[in-house]
């Protein structure tokens, strides 16, 4: 329903009547709502619900709402729906981050690495490598590496020792005889290896193609790793042709870890399916929501004078 | 290798159900939306049914929604399709894919018969 | 749902001949955030599963042969062989992955005249 009332808040534009050439200073319309009349002399402005696909984010003075952005590509989710207040906002589903408009999957850390720094929905996962004292023994993108077992407090002694990659293995000795010693074989620290740590940021990837200067016939390159920006490297164990390709250049600083990342870093979701996607669903498996306010370029640079 | 392998398929009758199995190896199964794809004898390909990387969210085509159900095992590097009433239509080769941004990778496929 | 369609069915093309395969989408795959189009095109060969030749609807597969290249934006595509060899002999398909469900054309086959 249009609406005529001025709310004694509201703020207000100016507007030049075409048929007097007089400047008019108008109440602006509330958000999702835009201005299909003009005030005059003698009538109020009128504000009309901006149409189905469109919306206006503040109270503005303008007389056409803004589009909405696309529908969210597959497998990209939505975060926040095309309404008369709010832009859509697509984001990457669970164990997926946003990389220049598509997804990418969350770095696993390799075994005898662990998480240092979670990947969120807009950053990847970042790996270190288990410092001394800690190990871990599965490759993850969740995990970090978790601390020895402490055998002599279980009344244990560690028959072998830990490594980056295994947790110390406990046992109890043979009682000895006063005329025997404990085998020289038997450890019982760590192994020298552990006294360095290395950090990775892990890798920034961005998904094939997407560089404005790619070739269409390029075919995948494996990428460089940016060793004057990183401590250590996770070691490439990957099969897989395709690896993290065209790391865009505009970015500084990107920390590249050449593991096992295939095709599969071309990818994109959606939280809430959009309404062009059908079929999308969360599954039982628990997964904290979407955190509120997440960055993106407005693609509406309309900032127009009128609105604000 | 980068290799997928399905297994399951066979002769069911109408009604029926089936689980169809694809092993992953030579890759990082966990970082991968997988896929599956089926084609009718003598017909073109036809998406079924997609998940992403962590479990998290599915995705069916409507001819196999609330009968089908994909899931994935990323310790055992395994995706799997749950196949419940079963109908003549569904029979197919069904095939894991995987990706997104195109499939890249696909299996040999595994032959599902239904029929009385 | 996003219909895609292929043409023609089927090409006869003579070795060494290019060949040419339309697919239009029944809405734009075109995203604009990212400039792309959401398109690949695969190789089926009789008993074998797919192979993928192209996405990003122009980005050549690692491993695929140069003779083969894809272009087109929004809803027409375009997969082109520029110099047909015996071993191209198969179905194609395009794929648009904008939106579920997830859709295929229905295959064009090439021959050899």
């Known amino acids: 329903q249009p609406e005529q009332k001025a709310s004694n808040l509201i703020g207000t534009y100016r507007h030049v009547d075409r048929a007097t050439g007089q400047v008019l200073t108008c109440d602006k319309c509330p958000a999702g709502t835009y201005v299909s009349e003009h005030c005059t002399n003698t009538s109020l402005r009128v504000c009309s619900s901006c149409p189905v696909g469109t919306f206006t984010r503040h109270e503005n003075g303008i007389e056409k709402c803004h589009d909405c952005s696309q529908p969210c590509p597959w497998p990209m989710i939505e975060k926040l729906p095309c309404a008369a207040l709010t832009d859509r906002e697509c984001t990457c589903p669970p164990g997926m981050f946003q990389s220049n408009a598509t997804c990418a999957p969350h770095t696993v850390c390799p075994v005898g690495w662990g998480v240092r720094k979670k990947g969120t929905e807009t950053e990847d996962v970042r790996c270190k490598q288990c410092a001394r004292g800690t190990f871990s023994d599965v490759p993850s993108s969740v995990m970090k590496c978790k601390a020895y077992t402490d055998c002599l407090s279980q009344n244990l002694v560690v028959i072998k020792p830990g490594t980056k990659e295994t947790d110390n293995v406990c046992g109890t000795l043979p009682s000895f005889s006063s005329s025997t010693s404990p085998s020289p074989g038997t450890a019982i620290f760590p192994r020298p290896e552990h006294m360095e740590t290395h950090e990775v940021p892990s890798s920034t990837y961005v998904p094939k193609g997407m560089n404005s200067t790619e070739s269409n016939s390029s075919a995948s390159v494996r990428p460089k790793v940016l060793s004057s920006i990183q401590e250590g490297t996770v070691p490439d164990n990957t099969s897989s042709a395709r690896g993290k390709e065209d790391v865009n250049k505009t970015l500084p600083n990107l920390q590249v870890v050449n593991h096992q990342q295939g095709p599969h870093h071309r990818h994109i979701l959606k939280l809430l399916p959009s309404m062009e996607a059908t079929g999308g669903e969360k599954s039982s498996t628990p997964i904290k929501g979407p955190k509120r306010g997440h960055p993106r370029q407005n693609l509406h640079k309309h900032f127009d004078i009128n609105e604000h | 290798e980068v290799q997928l392998l399905e297994s399951g398929g066979g002769l069911v009758q109408p009604g029926g159900s089936l689980r169809l199995s694809c092993a992953a190896s030579g890759f990082t199964f966990s970082m991968y939306i997988m896929n599956w794809v089926r084609q009718a004898p003598g017909k073109g390909l036809e998406w079924v049914s997609s998940?992403?990387?962590?479990?998290?969210?599915?995705f069916y085509a409507d001819s196999v929604k609330g009968r089908f159900t994909i899931s994935r095992d990323n310790s055992k590097n395994t995706l799997y399709l749950q196949m419940n009433s079963l109908r003549a239509e569904d029979t197919a080769v069904y095939y894991c894919a995987r990706g997104h941004y195109g499939m890249d990778v696909w299996g040999q496929g595994t032959t599902v018969t239904v029929s009385s | 749902d996003i219909q895609m369609t292929q043409s023609p069915d089927s090409l006869a093309v003579s070795l060494g001949e290019r060949a040419t395969i339309n697919c239009k989408s029944s809405?734009?795959?075109?995203?604009?955030?990212?400039?792309?189009?959401?398109l690949a095109w695969y190789q089926q060969k009789p008993g074998q599963p797919p192979k993928l030749l192209i996405y990003w609807a122009s980005t050549r597969e690692s491993g695929v042969p140069d003779r083969f290249s894809g272009s087109g934006s929004g809803t027409d595509f375009t997969l082109t062989i520029s110099s047909l060899q015996a071993e191209d002999v198969a179905v194609y398909y395009c794929q648009q992955y904008y939106s579920t469900p997830l859709t295929f054309g229905g295959g064009t086959k090439v021959e050899i005249k």
């Open positions: 809405r734009s795959v075109l995203y604009s955030s990212n400039n792309k189009n959401y």
């Open positions: 998940i992403v990387s962590s479990g998290g969210w599915t």
